[in-house]
């Protein structure tokens, strides 16, 4: 499965002849922390999952999506407080009886080792060391993310 950056690259190549792409905008907005090709923002207040989801939208961002175990570990390394929990963009879909990311994809069972039940009204939080299933109404902090946007450079052929 192609990453969003790879898909973007293919689209650009198809729509614009003689175009190259280089990684760009490697600076996150002020107050955001860069983690690889993402910018992360940690809240300083608490909210249920739905409110957290909505609040990230006000920052033109989304609740954190975690691609794999490696990204989880790198994110957890940014968490300084041992006992604090943060909502991420993953909740239990009752209709599909599976964990579903807010981008519509389902959790690969090998990606995260979730402590707790997979049931209705459950949402996923992370701490410095673990991943938990919590009632979505629980009031905790959250993490927003922005994807760093590739810069597109038009390369003109020699005349």
């Amino acid at each position: 499965q192609k990453s969003s950056i790879e898909k973007c690259s293919v689209d650009i190549q198809q729509s614009r002849n003689k175009t190259t792409e280089r990684p760009g905008l490697l600076n996150c907005p002020i107050y955001w922390q860069q983690l690889r090709e993402k910018c992360l923002l940690f809240s300083h207040t608490v909210n249920p999952w739905n409110n957290s989801l909505a609040d990230c939208s006000t920052k033109e961002s989304s609740l954190l999506l975690i691609r794999d175990k490696d990204e989880l570990i790198h994110t957890q390394n940014l968490i300084r407080d041992k006992a604090i929990l943060f909502w991420i963009g993953l909740n239990f879909s009752l209709s599909e009886k599976n964990w579903k990311w807010i981008n519509g994809s389902f959790l690969n069972s090998n990606d995260l080792e979730i402590r707790g039940d997979a049931k209705e009204n459950s949402c996923i939080s992370i701490s410095q060391t673990s991943v938990y299933s919590e009632y979505c109404s629980t009031e905790i902090r959250w993490i927003c993310q922005k994807e760093l946007t590739p810069v597109r450079n038009k390369v003109y052929p020699d005349s």
Partner: antibody
């Protein structure tokens, strides 16, 4: 303009409880998290905890976790901080302070302070 | 807990002087440092956030700098209304902590 108006001074005996109020005006009360900070006589500032008026969610400094309760009444745009089992070293000025941003920990507006004296 | 140590604790200066107050953190706090001014019997007033960003309405003679573990608040030319106590605060962790304060007095 933004204003946070706190309740008046209190004198309490050791072991008693005190409840301080903070009435907000000039902004959307549910749009900003409220914090409580105290200052003992001649001392520095100590953060006690926060309440999100929108949801009612709280988070307390572990030091006060067993003794503090923060609540709010959105109908009158008022936040409350109750501290129980008072001791003499709880004598301090208690401030409510508005969190300026959901994603940063600074306080942009403060109440005038409520003096709480704990004495037998 | 992250400790913040302010120096000096007391500072005597005259109107027109340039003064610098230092705040040292026991661990790296990035840029998550705030400065407040407090006058006797009053609540603290926000001056600077994120180590160097002046709050709206704060005069330009106040400036902040630093990152990591060492931060400074500078007042370029002291005015009579600037004599007060100044506090730094960190929010790199969710247990917000404050420095012990620097009392700025008239010489």
């Amino acid at each position: 303009q933004v204003q946070l108006v706190q309740s008046g001074a209190e004198v309490k005996k050791p072991g008693a409880s005190v409840k301080v109020s903070c009435k907000a005006s000039g902004y959307s009360f549910t749009g900003y998290t409220m914090n409580w900070v105290r200052q003992a006589p001649g001392q520095g500032l100590e953060w006690m905890g926060l309440i999100n008026p929108s949801s009612g969610g709280t988070y307390y400094n572990q030091k006060f976790k067993d003794r503090v309760t923060m609540t709010r009444d959105t109908s009158i745009s008022t936040a409350y901080m109750e501290l129980s089992r008072l001791r003499s070293d709880d004598t301090a000025v208690y401030y409510c302070a508005r969190l300026g941003d959901n994603y940063r920990g600074y306080f942009d507006y403060w109440g005038q302070g409520t003096t709480v004296t704990v004495s037998s | 807990d992250i400790q913040l140590t302010q120096s000096p604790s007391f500072l005597s200066a005259s109107v027109g002087d340039r003064v610098t107050i230092t705040c040292k953190a026991s661990q790296d706090v990035g840029s998550a440092v705030v400065w407040y001014q407090q006058k006797p019997g009053k609540a603290p007033k926000l001056l600077i956030d994120w180590a160097s960003i002046r709050h709206s309405g704060v005069p330009s003679r106040f400036s902040g700098s630093g990152s990591g573990t060492e931060f400074t608040l500078t007042i370029s030319s002291l005015q009579p209304e600037d004599f007060a106590t100044y506090y730094c605060q960190q929010y790199s962790t969710y247990l917000y902590t404050f420095g012990g304060g620097t009392k700025l007095e008239i010489k």
